[in-house]
Amino acid sequence: DPASKSRSCGEVRQIYGAKGFSLSDVPQAEISGEHLRICPQGYTCCTSEMEENLANRSHAELETALRDSSRVLQAMLATQLRSFDDHFQHLLNDSERTLQATFPGAFGELYTQNARAFRDLYSELRLYYRGANLHLEETLAEFWARLLERLFKQLHPQLLLPDDYLDCLGKQAEALRPFGEAPRELRLRATRAFVAARSFVQGLGVASDVVRKVAQVPLGPECSRAVMKLVYCAHCLGVPGARPCPDYCRNVLKGCLANQADLDAEWRNLLDSMVLITDKFWGTSGVESVIGSVHTWLAEAINALQDNRDTLTAKVIQGCGNPKVNPQGPGPEEKRRRGKLAPRERPPSGTLEKLVSEAKAQLRDVQDFWISLPGTLCSEKMALSTASDDRCWNGMARGRYLPEVMGDGLANQINNPEVEVDITKPDMTIRQQIMQLKIMTNRLRSAYNGNDVDFQDASDDGSGSGSGDGCLDDLCSRKVSRKSSSSRTPLTHALPGLSEQEGQKTS
């Protein structure tokens, strides 16, 4: 029909100009469309250059929409991570501050002379929580071994205790249980609590990382063509008012995001495991009551050592022989004051409950993020048709969209009518991210059972008082803690917000 040939390109001109492109490219009226490589080759208002520009623009717009959706999810995960991380670190810092404030008065030189050992223990716990490759049980055992050496010397200043005698003392330690049940209790509870806390926070970090990396995966050329056809070919073909048919849009985006949808199963597994591990935040071995109460076990341990001093000394002498007496040394130490214990169970502050309930709700909300992405983008970003089925843009003309909607994931795109997807070539970045999700899920499942996945051989029995028998590789750094320069000034180690004194830790 000659009349249709001379239809004006005014609407296309307006839309094209609004996108920032030069209007000189746009024909005044429709032209023959044999030159079109993506859109159907009927009469058109688009030149080759316009088609190329709009194809690039539609590709960029989809990538931007994808990044925007990812950014929202990333921001949510980052906020969660920061909130939990702040809370867990606050619990540990609080415990250390309490120790620094109360132990000098409660234990005198038994604390001040060993302040460095306590500082180092908290530093190691912090490092472990942050993901350092430390064996927590051995870290604790080594701490107790070192502390025993130091305290035994302090409780017997009249004795000459050379290194070989201290080595012997260390070998006896496990059988003697010098610190009572505190080391074992702390080890069992702290291992479970720290493993749960750190794996949960790591889970949030991995989830966020996966989203960030997947958002950077480029869309392939076949996807670009399909998106151009979906978004701008209606304009080129003179039906700019026709919006894409919903099922047509879903098929295009399911094809474009086929690899991303394959994240779904492992993503759900990860989020389920994260929700599950929050069960370990409560109760006597829970994160809140354990991490915030490390100092109470330390106090119990020192008290137990003082209470058992005479029995312990007798058994050590029995096992290691009579040490020499320093003729110029002071007499045996007087019985020390008994450190008053703070209540073991920290009353829950309510902060963690609030954090957990928010996190659970938000994690449930994003469980189907990857498979709902095509639908979300279509409904939120693609201005879908709400008209009756035969009035929407189907990729060829205004009319009904007949093909069925494809399933989710790469394998289901074998017959996608809109995007040619090679199902034999999965995207390697996304496969790597699926593997990261699997690994993190295994960590969380392991953590749920109280195990650190890096140290599956860790046994759950024994006293935990430490052997002191030589030096386990990389685990002997819990060393002497001397007092600050005046024996009257207890050493308070620098934490954010605390003033630095001489002899303090400096960051």
């Epitope: 002379q113 050992a117 500082r119 180092d120 530093s123 190691e124 490092l127 070192r146 050496e149 130091r150 010397k153 200043p157 000459l160 205790l161 050379p162 290194d163 201290l166 320093n326 040394g329 002071p330 030096c471 590789d473 990389d474 685990l475 002997c476 750094s477 819990r478 060393k479 002497v480 001397r482 007092k483 600050s484 320069s485 005046s486 024996s487 050493l491 001489e502 002899g503 830790k505 400096t506």
Partner: antibody
Framework: QVQLKQSGPELVKPGASVKISCKAS????????MHWVKQSPEKSLEWIGE????????TYNQKFKAKATLTVDKSSSTAYMQLKSLTSEDSAVYYC????????????WGQGTLVTVSS | DIVMSQSPKSMSMSVGERVALSCKAS??????VSWYQQKPEQSPKLLIY???NRYTGVPDRFTGSGSATDFTLTISSVQAEDLADYYC?????????FGAGTKLELK
């Protein structure tokens, strides 16, 4: 056997900085605190500070807090000390020293690094 | 800071003589005192720790004694190879401090 090998002598200009190293071998580097000691003819031995290679925690002698910065590189089992704003008073031999066990007793010493500050 | 005072500054001895080097702390340091030997052009070497424990490989002519504020390093029979500077140091409190040293010379 335990060895601490320090970097060679340094001749530096006043106001400059210098970073000296101490490479440890023969033991678990992160297992023992590393200390730094200054020896000058006038002041005999002066303790500068210590670092826990496992955690990076440091403790300084107040006198050297603005002068020295202690760091470690765990991957190469090396401890470092940077001295800044050097003056002739900083001319000395600097030693790294490792504790015997957990008692602030230095059983192992590096061979020393002579730092000369001169214009 | 705890001040460690050594005396005498130097002493001349003959081989075979007994020598006692003194170290006094400005405040109680328990038995947290070590003794170091430094020969010319060498690094210091540990002799005694914990005021009176001889370190591995140190000849038994070296003996440490004392506690609280008064400490002594005794060489029962001086040998030619003992010509060196001797330093005491305390590890009781921060900052760790050393004495100014005693130079042992041979007559």
């Amino acid at each position: 056997q335990v060895q601490l090998k320090q970097s060679g002598p340094e001749l530096v200009k006043p106001g400059a900085s210098v970073k000296i190293s101490c490479k440890a071998s023969g033991y678990s580097f992160t297992g023992y605190y590393m200390h730094w000691v200054k020896q000058s003819p006038e002041k005999s031995l002066e303790w500068i500070g210590e670092i826990n290679p496992s955690t990076g925690d440091t403790t300084y002698n107040q006198k050297f807090k603005a002068k020295a910065t202690l760091t470690v590189d765990k991957s190469s089992s090396t401890a470092y000390m940077q001295l800044k704003s050097l003056t002739s008073e900083d001319s000395a031999v600097y030693y790294c020293a490792r504790e015997k066990r957990d008692d602030g007793v230095f059983a192992y010493w590096g061979q020393g690094t002579l730092v000369t500050v001169s214009s | 800071d705890i001040v460690m005072s050594q005396s005498p500054k130097s002493m001349s001895m003959s081989v075979g003589e007994r020598v006692a080097l003194s170290c006094k702390a400005s405040e109680n340091v328990g038995t947290y005192v070590s003794w170091y030997q430094q020969k010319p052009e060498q690094s210091p070497k540990l002799l005694i720790y914990g005021a009176s424990n001889r370190y591995t490989g140190v000849p038994d002519r070296f003996t440490g004694s004392g506690s609280a504020t008064d400490f002594t390093l005794t060489i029962s029979s001086v040998q030619a190879e003992d010509l060196a500077d001797y330093y005491c140091g305390q590890s009781y409190s921060y900052p760790l401090t050393f004495g100014a040293g005693t130079k042992l010379e041979l007559k």
